[in-house]
């Protein structure tokens, strides 16, 4: 028996369902009574889902997993993982034993898009050229950790005086706060880009200072 899985990681959005694909080639005359199928976490060997003794033994993992019972006899041993969480991320091993055994691991990468950044200034009034201001770019509920880039109105990267912090909430999603300290020119635009490295998703925020008033 030869087990095959996708070599590329499966990318799943938080709160959506994901399918971890696994297949084997049944011999002629194969019946499900011969099958021992186990999905487990690769590192800890924690049981996730199993099929043995001719029947689906169910989920051993948060009751959020399912096989495709009608397709098993054709060699489809894929696992459905429902309502994906950040903590589901990692490697899963598909182990198939019939006459012989084989196994392969598939990687699950969890992702969540970042919100459109909100921009705040401090101080936010009586601004004059030459003043030092703090611009904060905040984006929420993303995963994994973001990459943050700042640019001026001409598209020139601003790398000095930038402090970025990322805090995970109780669901494991990150809130990003990036602070840029700049000396104001006569006018200018400051842009913040929050990038999700897995989804290749960019969220943009900007603030334009043209004397008074400010535009966001």
């Amino acid at each position: 028996v030869e087990v095959q899985v996708s070599e590329d990681p499966v990318v799943a959005l938080v709160d959506t369902d994901a399918t971890l694909r696994c297949s084997f080639s049944p011999e002629p005359g194969f019946s499900l009574a011969q099958l021992n199928l186990i999905w487990q976490l690769t590192d800890t060997k924690q049981l996730v889902h199993s099929f043995t003794e001719g029947r689906d033994q169910g989920s051993a993992y948060s009751n959020r997993t399912a096989l495709f019972p009608d397709l098993l006899v054709q060699g489809n041993a894929s696992l459905r993982l429902q309502r994906v969480r950040v903590t589901d991320e990692g490697s899963y091993t598909c182990f198939v034993s019939i006459q012989d055994f084989d196994s392969a691991a598939v990687s699950l990468q969890v992702a969540a898009p970042y919100s459109k950044p909100s921009m705040t200034l401090e101080p936010n009034k009586d601004l004059r050229p030459g003043n030092m201001v703090t611009i904060t770019c905040s984006s929420y509920q993303g995963y994994p950790e973001a990459e943050v880039f700042w640019k001026d109105g001409q598209g020139v990267p601003l790398t000095g005086n930038v402090t970025t912090s990322q805090m995970a909430n109780e669901r494991g999603l990150f809130d990003v706060h990036s602070v840029l300290r700049v000396v104001l020119g006569a006018n200018g635009t400051y842009s913040c880009l929050v990038r999700n490295p897995v989804l290749q998703q960019d969220a943009h925020g900007s603030v334009t200072i043209t004397g008074q008033p400010l535009t966001f």
Partner: antibody
Amino acid sequence: EVQLVESGGDLVQPGGSLKLSCAASGFTFSSYGMSWVRQTPDKRLELVATINSNGGTTYYPDSVKGRFTISRDNAKHTLYLQMSSLKSEDTAMYYCTRNEEFRRGLAYWGQGTLVTVSA
Amino acid sequence: DIQMIQSPASLSVSVGETVTITCRASENIYSNLAWYQQKQGKSPQLLVYAATNLADGVPSRFSGSGSGTQYSLKINSLQSEDFGSYYCQHFWGTPPWTFGGGTKLEIK
């Protein structure tokens, strides 16, 4: 008749290496997974390596991982166990076994070959 | 890895008696369990597979039972040739499939 004949056991110093062989006959060797099981002087049994029929998948317990390597030559109907960085606790009788259809246990065992690790 | 706790470690009984050896798994192994007998100086021999099935040539006085995490091997009316050591082994999940510590059955 299924036959499994082990060879290669010897007295070896700690840190040394040894390669065990198992010659199989009486069945279609390339259709079966195979395992090495050892029995320590205190009579405990431990499965130290297992390999599937085409040699593509192997498993080891933590006690030997990185030190032992199981392999097979289906053309020669032979199973191997390469052991390196040997320790005194590897002293045991090493048995070659055939993996049966799942849940059917290890129905065929060789006579064993003795490995002694001692200074 | 799954742990197999076998008891008792040793047993001294007379011919004709009935004995029961038990094996407890650290998690559900879904009847993926084998029992072996080993005589002094010999290789282990398969007695029971899939918890309850007798291997070829095994006398009917041997029987296996159990499910989930608890399994047992029963020998009715012990014969002199039954003395030796007995081991359980699970076959659940990915290898290595671990053995119990063994039970030495001696003549009283």
